[in-house]
């Protein structure tokens, strides 16, 4: 049985032009962690792969940084970048596990500093 | 929803080669694996090989290394096949299936592409 | 490479009944090992994955076991619409191999 759970940072704003950290945890389970894909609308940005290393999408090589640990960084942000994101766990033996991150990029300096994740 | 759309069934001829397409749509294409599996005729199941979509790196079942290349598309989100020198033997059903990273289990098929190979 | 072996080729139930499939591994593949239902003309159905986990959506009436060499797939209270061949996989190492299939019957 799958017992783990996904903690994510939630629904999350940032600021035009600046940068966000998305951040994914699995807990509750022994399971390996095989690979992680970043998503967005059947989209990939990234994969960390645990014997391979990290991939970035050609798309998004300008504005996407691998790291912290399993996380991903988005930079240079437009408010085209706001939407759904999806970090995916494949696990060993598990199976796969799902979070979802809701970004919201906002024109003005008002973003709210929600996120223990963002970058200043 | 997650599918995978294959091409239509190929009538060829001994020697000929063929090239089988399997499209994938509803989830980010390449960050999976899509493996291709043989069925003869009222026969089990055999594993041909696999292709990592993100960068096109292949492993191939020793019994189909020099018959079977596997090739991708990314803009297309299309994974593809080629069969070459085809025998009478190589008349099947082939299916592309997608997996995750470990463990290789298959999740989701594609509907299968009839290959006859006729003299 | 690795031979799994489904000693029954054919196995007959009645609705309503418990039936168990049988897959051995000819070496220790751990847990790693899948069953697939495959319906007349269909392309095949991923049930189980990692011997004993159902996959999304698959009902709680169809269960996997085992571990090492020997696995079991069992259904219980057996439906018309499982009339299908079942096929065990080992997802342990490549070359991935299936096993030669169980061909459920309802009487």
């Known amino acids: 049985m799958m017992t783990g759970t996904i903690e994510t940072t939630g629904n999350i704003s940032a600021e035009k032009g600046g940068s966000i950290i998305l951040q994914c945890h699995l807990s509750s389970t022994t399971a390996q962690v095989t690979q992680v894909n970043w998503e967005q609308q059947d989209q990939l940005l990234a994969i960390c792969n645990a014997d391979l290393g990290w991939h970035i999408s050609p798309s998004f090589k300008d504005r996407v940084a691998p790291g912290p640990g399993l996380g991903l960084t988005l930079q240079s942000l437009t408010v085209n970048d706001t939407g759904e994101y999806f970090c995916i766990y494949h696990t060993y033996p598990d199976g796969t596990y799902t979070g979802r991150i809701f970004l919201e990029v906002l024109e003005s300096s008002v973003a709210e500093h929600g996120a223990r994740f963002q970058i200043p | 929803e997650v599918q995978l759309q294959q091409s239509g069934p190929e009538l060829v001829k001994t020697g000929a080669s063929v090239k089988i397409s399997c499209k994938a749509s509803?989830?980010?294409?390449?960050?999976?694996?899509i493996h291709w599996v043989k069925q003869s005729h009222g026969k089990s199941l055999e594993w041909i090989g696999h292709?990592?979509?993100?960068?096109?790196?292949?492993n191939y079942n020793q019994n189909f290394k020099g018959k079977a290349t596997f090739t991708v598309d990314t803009s297309s989100s299309t994974a593809y096949m080629q069969f070459n020198s085809l025998t009478s033997e190589d008349s099947a059903v082939y299916y592309c299936?997608?997996?995750?990273?470990?463990?290789?289990?298959?999740?989701?098929w594609g509907a299968g592409t009839t290959v006859t190979v006729s003299s | 490479d690795i031979v799994m072996t489904q000693s029954h080729k054919f196995m007959s139930t009645s609705v309503g009944d418990r039936v168990s499939i049988t897959c051995k591994a000819s070496?220790?593949?751990?847990?790693?090992v899948a069953w697939y239902q495959q319906r007349p003309g269909q392309s095949p159905k991923l049930l189980i994955y990692?011997?004993?986990y159902r996959y999304t959506g698959v009902p709680d009436r169809f269960t996997g076991s085992g571990s090492g060499t020997d696995f079991t797939f069992t259904i219980n209270n057996v439906q018309a619409e499982d009339l299908a061949v079942y096929y065990c996989?080992?997802?342990?190492?490549?070359?991935?191999?299936f096993g030669g299939g169980t061909k459920l019957e309802i009487k």
């Open positions: 509803g989830y980010a294409f390449t960050g999976y694996y």
């Open positions: 990692s011997a004993s």
């Open positions: 070496q220790d593949v751990s847990t790693d």
């Open positions: 996989q080992q997802h342990y190492s490549t070359p991935y191999t």
């Open positions: 292709i990592t979509c993100y960068n096109g790196a292949t």
């Open positions: 299936a997608r997996s995750n990273y470990r463990p290789w289990y298959f999740d989701v």
